[in-house]
């Protein structure tokens, strides 16, 4: 079948990294600079992806494979194959159309991306707040108030690692 196909279509013999050049009697010509063909039998080579500005090159383009981009430091990838770059924020912030903004009181974000999320409501689980929340960290829930009643084994709360929840700005 392969032999039959190649008799019918001489282009099928052109390997990856080349294209079937109609201007030269369907001879297999190498892909020009800054282009590639990742499969055989191609009639054109594809233009290499350019990683510039918000993008930087993770893998150079070759005659048989496209360039791969990631994001310039300060930004992170979004989408399949890093199709977009989005600004990083600091912990305790979220990205809005106005740029990075501090989390509102009662919310936190412990990452450089994503949105501020509400602190855990310890009382919903019948627990008490052991360590207050901050812009960067969720609250830590401790034993239920009943567990701390006289006679029960007491738990000494650890000293807070950070300042308690900040006031609205």
């Amino acid at each position: 079948f392969e032999r039959t196909r190649s008799l019918q279509d001489p282009c099928s013999n052109c390997p990856a990294g080349t294209f079937c050049d109609n201007n030269r009697n369907q001879i297999c010509s190498p892909c020009p600079p800054n282009s590639f063909s990742s499969a055989g039998g191609q009639r054109t080579c594809d233009i290499c992806r350019q990683c510039k500005g918000v993008f930087r090159t993770r893998k150079e383009c070759s005659s048989t494979s496209n360039a791969e981009c990631d994001c310039t430091p300060g930004f992170h990838c979004l989408g399949a194959g890093c199709s977009m770059c989005e600004q990083d924020c600091k912990q305790g912030q979220e990205l809005t159309k106005k740029g990075c903004k501090d989390c509102c009181f009662g919310t936190f974000n412990d990452q450089k991306r994503g949105i501020c999320r509400p602190w855990t409501n310890c009382s919903l689980d019948g627990k008490s707040v052991l360590v207050n929340g901050t812009k960067e960290r969720d609250v830590v829930c401790g034993p239920s108030p009943a567990d701390l009643s006289p006679g029960a084994s007491s738990v000494t709360p650890p000293a807070p690692a950070r300042e308690p929840g900040h006031s609205p700005q």
Partner: nanobody, 123 residues
Framework: QVQLVESGGGLVQPGGSLRLSCTAS?????DYWMNWVRQAPGKGLEW???????????YYVDSVEGRFTISRDNARNSLYLQMTSLREEDTAMYYC????????????????SGQGTTVTVSS
């Protein structure tokens, strides 16, 4: 082919002004949010300003608010950044970047940017 080309950079003294331009081709410019971002020598990339498709919303990073003005001319497929009261810390490579599909709704990702234009503020 989608392309953004920046121009207008140069050497300017502190307190001076400069106007950057970005010319877009290969896509419907008026359908996209546009951004300016910059990278100072040895630093990470920093978002500077953005502008909505029709120019009705504009936002700035705090450090340039009141000094820089972003604008666009959809008829000319052009984006601008008017920079006044320039400081040495504004020295950077400036890039224009297109907001990706859905920008402002569920993400603030940028999917195309240019080669950049260099701004140097020095006495």
């Amino acid at each position: 082919q989608v392309q953004l080309v920046e121009s207008g950079g140069g050497l300017v003294q502190p307190g001076g002004s400069l106007r950057l331009s970005c010319t877009a081709s290969g896509f419907t410019f008026s359908d996209y949010w546009m951004n300016w971002v910059r990278q100072a020598p040895g630093k990470g990339l920093e978002w500077v300003a953005n502008i909505k498709e029709d120019g009705s919303e504009k936002y700035y990073v705090d450090s340039v608010e009141g000094r820089f003005t972003i604008s666009r001319d959809n008829a000319r497929n052009s984006l601008y950044l008017q920079m006044t009261s320039l400081r040495e810390e504004d020295t950077a490579m400036y890039y224009c970047a297109r907001g990706g599909e859905g920008y402002g709704d569920n993400h603030y990702g940028m999917d195309v940017s240019g080669q950049g234009t260099t701004v140097t503020v020095s006495s």
